[in-house]
């Protein structure tokens, strides 16, 4: 196999008895993406697969970047919070049991939720065989794979390969269509010697040799262009050091009252379980760990406040206190922990060292192609397509990996709008109620009438504003029974949610500023009722009073208007959103400084922003009754997050509104919190922390959609599968490995 050139088969070349291509899912634990480029010459077989087949620059692991959570994510398409295997070690207060890799408890089906690939295949009439895979020797939903091997790490790799080849030799009626294969290397060697070590190099040669044996065995059976093979890893690997340790004893006078899952992705819970599990004061722990040292190498979070892109909160097994640790550092209880040096993983899945490999080859896959990175939650849908079966519900976005396939099996389409919109019409230029708002600049009713008349756009003006400010179409509302209307202005368009009494979204385009002349002075101390929205559906300005710790923010920033007069279009109740005063500082800095920077760098950006309500922190928009539970004696619900989606043209010679090809996206989902303690901003100007904070909360457009019930880019003329690629793209700015 190795000596031959890449075969370019237009259709599957399967021998007699193989009606449809088998699928082999092959995992090499801890094979970080960088190894593939640094040591390619030492891995001729894997390198040939990379050259001849399709590969991604890397595949993103889910957080925490550990073995069991990611292997099970790969075969279910679910986030760890959804499938339940949230770490290699965990406690479930409802089961009152501990899960670990060294105990038989791991084979208790109660830990394993979701539907793994082997069951999806079996439920649809196919056989499945697993040569090791986390979960494969557990009776999930009462069933095991058709063929499985009890885990035994001492079985030589060659023996594993020859067994799998024997399975492929089984009579057609007994032969599986789906296979898994698992190697512990290069992870074991990476832990022992670190990622840059002779041990890893040796391990890479060993796994490459075994992989070559598989490919040679397939060739002997004339299956090398029949089998669809996916070679991937669960996560990467990074170096750790014994002088890069954070000890909890440096932060607490005593530590015996809590239990800590130590390492690169630490969690803290009560020591006395189950008794103290729910009464444990997690908030106090986070307070005591926040902004304690100038060079602190972890950030403490309550899990609902973690970046939403992590999807690591909604599970009782995920302890409320979470430490987000710096690259190559470890957080542990005390100096008695000497488990350092060598390699480790579990860190932030955006770190380049945590990136995993993804390569694929076979009749269904494109050849000699490199694709952009994607997340491992997408692999399950891809495997279902390869097997031509229906996936179980999962967190992947079906169709987003269609560009890997020669002929896609599943053709996605845009979601149908669930709640239709109306237009909030202009009836009277004078408000029937002031809504307790005031504007000292408008001294009489004639002036008020004048500025309100500006809200009454002609059809031509509406068409013009839509073209510029909604270049990819308005966001469609996928939530049920959401009464909302469109509000058109010359410089922005918004979708107003009547039940929430606030805009659901606001869309506007910031041009590349040709001149650097300052924006006109803003008229911030002025607010008035929007005459197009009935008072019963509007916010009252008196909602924003001091003892609520909440101030008014503008979703569309009034200062973005180029003239003082047009600012009045934004100084209206329909543009108001509730914001914590400290949050608003960050929000205002983003819009007045960072947004202009982005627009300048990208030849203009389209901005869509809005509130998010995710009180139950499940990553999905809350039902109205869930939000109502959190109304603190007020008519206006306080968002848990705000989103901002920046879209520009990939080809920077085009503006967003005239973009013929691919788009570039930069979405943010910023937790709406009363303080900025996450950034330790004391004594620091905004320039030193706001951008970093926004960057920490970058997300995918898809994450925004799930949290808002909105659907974006429906009017962008581009195949839906390409739009899905855009929506599942996560921008990253990590440069060092």
């Amino acid at each position: 196999w190795l000596e031959e050139n890449c075969d370019t088969a237009q259709q599957s070349q399967c021998p007699e008895g193989f009606d449809l291509p088998p699928v082999i899912l092959f995992s090499m634990d801890g094979f970080r993406a960088e190894y593939l480029y640094t040591w390619d010459t030492l891995m001729p077989n894997i390198n040939k697969l990379k050259t001849c087949g399709i590969h991604s620059k890397y595949m993103r692991a889910m957080y925490p970047t550990k073995t069991f959570p990611n292997h099970y994510t790969i075969v279910t398409g679910l986030y760890p919070e959804s499938h339940g295997i949230i770490d290699n070690n965990m406690y479930d207060v409802n089961l009152n049991k501990n899960f670990s890799l060294s105990s038989k408890e791991q084979n208790n089906p109660a830990w394993w939720h979701g539907q793994p690939m082997w069951l999806t295949a079996m439920y649809q009439g196919l056989k499945a065989a697993t040569y090791f895979w986390p979960g494969s020797e557990v009776a999930i939903n009462g069933s095991f794979p058709s063929i499985y091997m009890p885990y035994n790490g001492s079985v030589p790799f060659e023996e594993r390969i020859s067994t799998l080849l024997k399975w492929l030799d089984l009579p057609k009626a007994e032969r599986p269509r789906f296979y898994t294969m698992y190697f512990e290397e290069p992870d074991s060697s990476g832990h022992a010697g670190g990622p840059v070590s002779a041990r890893v190099i040796k391990a890479l040669q060993v796994v490459d040799h075994a992989f070559g044996m598989l490919m040679e065995g397939l060739k002997q059976r004339n299956l090398h262009n029949c089998v669809n093979i996916i070679l991937l890893a669960d996560h990467g690997m990074d170096q750790t050091y014994c002088n890069k340790m954070e000890y909890m004893t440096d932060y607490f006078p005593r530590i015996n009252f809590f239990y800590m899952y130590e390492g690169p992705a630490p969690r803290i819970r009560a020591h006395n379980i189950p008794h103290d599990f729910f009464s444990f004061n997690s908030e106090e722990i986070v307070r005591n760990l926040s902004c304690r040292k100038p060079d602190q190498h972890f950030k403490p979070y309550l899990t609902p406040d973690l970046p939403k892109r992590l999807h690591y909160a909604k599970n009782v097994r995920i302890d409320k206190v979470h430490l987000f640790v710096d690259q190559q550092w470890l957080a542990v209880r005390s100096k008695s922990n000497t488990n350092c040096g060598g390699g480790n993983h579990g860190y932030n899945n955006e770190f380049r060292s945590m990136e995993a490999i993804f390569l694929a080859h076979g009749p269904s896959f494109k050849e000699k192609t490199e694709v952009e990175p994607f997340e491992n939650i997408e692999v399950y849908n891809l495997m279902c397509d390869l097997l031509r079966i229906q996936p179980a519900p999962n967190n992947g976005t079906h169709g987003s990996l269609n560009h890997l396939l020669k002929v896609p099996f599943y053709e996605p389409s845009h979601a149908e709008e669930v709640s239709k919109f109306s237009v909030c019409g202009f009836a009277n230029p004078l408000p029937t109620e002031s809504l307790d708002c005031f504007c000292p600049h408008l001294q009489n009713s004639t002036q008020l009438e004048q500025v309100n008349q500006m809200l009454n756009l002609t059809q031509e003006e509406i068409t013009a504003t839509v073209k510029v400010n909604l270049p990819f179409g308005r966001p469609r509302v996928l939530q049920k029974n959401v009464d909302h209307c469109l509000l058109y202005h010359r410089e922005y368009v918004s979708g107003f949610g009547k039940a929430m009494r606030m805009p659901m979204w606001s869309s506007y385009t910031v041009p590349q500023l040709g001149d650097t002349s300052p924006l006109p002075p803003t008229v911030p101390d002025c607010l008035r009722a929007d005459v197009r929205v009935p008072p019963s559906e509007s916010q009252k300005c008196s909602f924003y009073l001091a003892d609520k710790n909440i101030t008014h923010g503008f979703l569309y920033p009034p200062a973005s208007n180029r003239t003082s007069d047009s600012q009045y279009d934004a100084l209206i109740t329909s543009n108001l959103v509730p914001m914590y005063e400290e949050f608003r500082k960050m929000w205002d800095y983003f819009h007045s400084v960072l947004l202009i920077k982005h627009a300048t760098e990208r030849n203009g950006v389209n901005v869509v922003s809005g509130p998010i309500f995710d009180y139950n922190y499940d990553g999905h928009f809350d039902a109205p009754d869930e939000i109502t539970k959190h109304l603190a004696n007020t008519d206006v619900p306080i968002p848990t997050h705000y989103f901002v989606v920046l879209t520009s043209c990939k080809n920077k010679s085009h503006t967003p509104e005239n973009c013929p090809g691919w788009l570039d996206v930069l979405p943010f989902i910023i937790p709406h919190r009363p303080t900025n303690v996450e950034s330790c901003p004391e004594g620091k100007p905004e320039a030193l922390w706001v951008e970093e904070r926004f960057t920490a909360h970058i997300a995918r457009v898809r994450d925004v959609e799930l949290l808002t019930g909105l659907d974006f880019y429906q009017d962008k003329v581009q195949p839906v599968s390409e739009i899905l690629q855009l929506k599942t793209y996560l921008p990253t700015f990590e440069t060092t490995i």
Partner: antibody
Amino acid sequence: EVQLVESGPGLVKPSETLSLTCTVSGGSISSSSYYWGWIRQPPGKGLEWIGSMYYSGSTYHNPSLKSRVIISVDTSKNQFSLKLSSVTAADTAVYYCARHYITVAGIFDYWGQGTLVTVSS
Amino acid sequence: QSVLTQPPSASGTPGQRATISCSGSSTNIGSTIVNWYQQVPGTAPKLLIYSNNQRPSGVPDRFSGSKSGTSASLAISGLQSEDEADYYCAAWDASLNGPVFGGGTKLTVL
């Protein structure tokens, strides 16, 4: 807890300019959420609003006093000031500085303790 | 002459209920919210009721406010001796383009 403290001379001669300063602590005068205002109360009488200002410098005043009033801000010192020119005996009052929420008319939630200014020769 | 009209005095015995009225016009009370302030002699006024009927934190629920048309009223139930003070109503006046106050009502607890 926000605190406001008025300071300035307690005695001003007729036709001169009354100058008072209000120092804010426990909160920033540069907050985008508040106006900072002056109110006065002649002895044994009711309250009268003089004028208010926003940290950016925009101000508005009681029309009956407007031509005589200047309100200014010094964000670096977290202070704002009142100047009332051409004073007469009718301007004798306790002068209060206060904070009110930007979006809502005239809800003064925090007040200084007040300073008595007597206009007399 | 104050823009908003209040009775100069009101009284009640401990435990009783007292009511203070405030009358304005369409340019003030009729088109916006009413706020009430309490001023104990020798001290600064304190916000007692805002937005017609909302109490800032720390104000007992014995104090309540209401508004109807161009008039408003403050009610104090279960009068206590410490309630003895001057009470001022206030509202934004659109024609003045600023806040206006009532002349104040001196409440005596007998």
